[in-house]
C-alpha cells in the first residue's frame, strides 16, 4: 500500500495505490483511491507512468479528456466514472500488454487540494493448474497443465504423506511457448503415485503463485486449485 | 513520421489580418491536443493558445484572448490560427506544436508573420 | 500565471565542461509537468527533457534533469560543439503555458 500526500501550495490530499499485477492479454486494474469531494466538476485524474511522455489518462470536469494520452495507452485505458465521485480513481487497463509494466503515479486534483501516489504494476502470464490422473501411462502417473505462464516459473510437487519429500528425481517439467510466442504452457508429470495421499503441483514465477491440489483415493478423485497474486502492496 | 507544416505567413499591415495554417501528417491528429507558439526576433518562446482534440477546451495567453482565434478540421488534418487586429508586437515566427502529456513533443518549422506598415 | 525564471540567461562553455542550467518557478508545479527544449540557431524548438527528468527519444545520455516544487535544472554531462544551442524550460501545469525566458548556451 502506498498513500501519498499532496504538494504544497494548496492543501494536500491523501491518496493511496495499491502494487498489482496484469496478466497478459486480459484487463487489468490500476488501483487508486482518494478523499472524495462532493462536486465530481472540481475533480481531475491524471495517470501518468514513469518513462512515458503521454498521460496514461487523464479525466476532467467529469469525463475523460484524452488529448494529451500516450499512443500506447490509445483505446484501452477507462476510469469507474460513477465512483470518481465517492473517491475511486482506479484505472482500468484493458489487453495488458508485456510493455504496461513499470512504475504509475495516480495524480488527483480536488477542491480540498492535491495528492499523488506511485503504484508498481507488474504484467506476466499466471494461470490455473489442473492436476489429472494420466491413465495412458504405464505406472500412476499425474499430470499437471496450466495454460499460460510468463516469465517461465518453477514447478514443486509435494505430497501431504511424504511432507518435505523432494519429487524431482520423479517428475518432468516443459514448457511449450504458446502461439503469441510469449506465454508459455507448463506441463508437469509425476512418477509412482501412490494411492489415498494428496498431491500438489506448485507452479510459481514472481507474479503469481497456483497450486492443484488432487486427491486419489481407490472410490474417488477430489481436485481444488486456487491463485495468488505476489506483492500486492498498499501505497 | 510525425510532420508538421505551417503556412499563410507574410506581410501584413497593422489592424489587419491572417489566418495560418498548420498540415499535420505520420499520427492521429484527431485524437490530439495542439498548440501555436511564437517566437519574436531574436526574443524567446511564447505560448499563444491550445485546442483539444475535439475543440471543446480552447486556451488563449492574455496577449491575444479576443484578437486570435484557434481552430480545427480533424477531416483535413489541419490546424488553423485566425489572428485579427494585428499588431507590431505579433510580428514573430509562428509554430505549432503537438502537445503530448503537457509537453509539445513535435514542432513544425515555423511561418513568419511580419506587422508593419 | 506561473512564472518561470531561467538563469544564467547566457553561458559559454569549454567541450568536455560539464554545464547546469537552471529554471525557477513563482509557484508549484503540479503532476512534474516540467519539460526542456533545446533550439539550435536556425531550428525549432526540440522537446529535450520532459516531466523534470525523463529523455525525450533520441537525446543522449548526456542530458539530465532534476528539480521538484519551484527549482529545476538541466546538466549537460560534458559539452559538446553541437549542444551550442538555447535551452527553454516550459511547465504544462497551469493555464496559461509558459516558458522560461531561455539560456544561450555558447562554446568557448
Known amino acids: 500500500l502506498i498513500i501519498g500526500f499532496g504538494i504544497s501550495g494548496r492543501h494536500s490530499i491523501t491518496v493511496t495505490t495499491v502494487a498489482s499485477a496484469g496478466n497478459i492479454g486480459e484487463d487489468g486494474i490500476l488501483s487508486c483511491t482518494f478523499e472524495p469531494d462532493i462536486k465530481l466538476s472540481d475533480i481531475v485524474i491524471q495517470w501518468l507512468k514513469e518513462g512515458v511522455l503521454g498521460l496514461v489518462h487523464e479525466f476532467k470536469e467529469g469525463k475523460d479528456e484524452l488529448s494529451e494520452q500516450d499512443e500506447m495507452f490509445r483505446g484501452r485505458t477507462a476510469v469507474f466514472a460513477d465512483q470518481v465521485i465517492v473517491g475511486n480513481a482506479s484505472l482500468r487497463l484493458k489487453n495488458v500488454q508485456l510493455t504496461d509494466a513499470g512504475t504509475y503515479k495516480c495524480y488527483i486534483i480536488t477542491s480540498k487540494g492535491k495528492g499523488n501516489a506511485n503504484l508498481e504494476y507488474k504484467t506476466g502470464a499466471f494461470s490455473m493448474p489442473e492436476v489429472n490422473v494420466d491413465y495412458n501411462a504405464s505406472s500412476e502417473t499425474l499430470r499437471c497443465e496450466a495454460p499460460r505462464w510468463f516469465p517461465q516459473p518453477t514447478v514443486v510437487w509435494a505430497s501431504q504423506v511424504d511432507q518435505g519429500a523432494n519429487f524431482s528425481e520423479v517428475s518432468n517439467t516443459s514448457f511449450e511457448l504458446n502461439s503469441e510466442n510469449v506465454t508459455m504452457k507448463v506441463v508437469s508429470v509425476l512418477y509412482n503415485v501412490t494411492i489415498n495421499n494428496t498431491y500438489s503441483c506448485m507452479i510459481e514465477n514472481d507474479i503469481a503463485k497456483a497450486t492443484g491440489d488432487i486427491k486419489v483415493t481407490e472410490s474417488e478423485i477430489k481436485r481444488r486449485s486456487h491463485l495468488q497474486l505476489l506483492n500486492s502492496k498498499a501505497s | 513520421e510525425v510532420q508538421l507544416v505551417e503556412s499563410g505567413g507574410g506581410l501584413v499591415k497593422p489592424g489587419g489580418s491572417l489566418k495560418l495554417s498548420c498540415a499535420a501528417s505520420?499520427?492521429?491528429?484527431?485524437?490530439?491536443?495542439m498548440h501555436w507558439v511564437r517566437q519574436a526576433p531574436e526574443k524567446g518562446l511564447e505560448w499563444i493558445t491550445y485546442?483539444?482534440?475535439?475543440?471543446?477546451?480552447?486556451y488563449y495567453a492574455d496577449s491575444v484572448k479576443g484578437r486570435f482565434t484557434i481552430s480545427r478540421d480533424n477531416a483535413k488534418n489541419t490546424l488553423f490560427l485566425q489572428m485579427t487586429s494585428l499588431r507590431s508586437e505579433d510580428t514573430a515566427m509562428y509554430y505549432c506544436a503537438r502537445g503530448r502529456g503537457y509537453a509539445m513533443d513535435y514542432w513544425g518549422q515555423g511561418t513568419s508573420v511580419t506587422v508593419s506598415s | 500565471e506561473i512564472v518561470l525564471t531561467q538563469s544564467p540567461t547566457t553561458m559559454a562553455a569549454s567541450p568536455g565542461e560539464k554545464i547546469t542550467i537552471f529554471c525557477s518557478a513563482s509557484s508549484s508545479i503540479s503532476s512534474d509537468f516540467l519539460h526542456w527544449y533545446q533550439q539550435k540557431p536556425g531550428f525549432s524548438p526540440k522537446l529535450l527533457i520532459y516531466?523534470?527528468?525523463n529523455l525525450a527519444s533520441g537525446v543522449p545520455a548526456r542530458f539530465s534533469g532534476s528539480g521538484s516544487g519551484t527549482s529545476y535544472s538541466l546538466t549537460i554531462g560534458t559539452m559538446e560543439a553541437e549542444d551550442v544551442a538555447t535551452y527553454y524550460c516550459q511547465q504544462g501545469s497551469n493555464v496559461p503555458r509558459t516558458f522560461g525566458g531561455g539560456t544561450k548556451l555558447e562554446i568557448k
Open positions: 505520420g499520427f492521429t491528429f484527431s485524437d490530439s491536443g
Open positions: 485546442i483539444n482534440s475535439g475543440s471543446s477546451t480552447i
Open positions: 516531466r523534470i527528468s
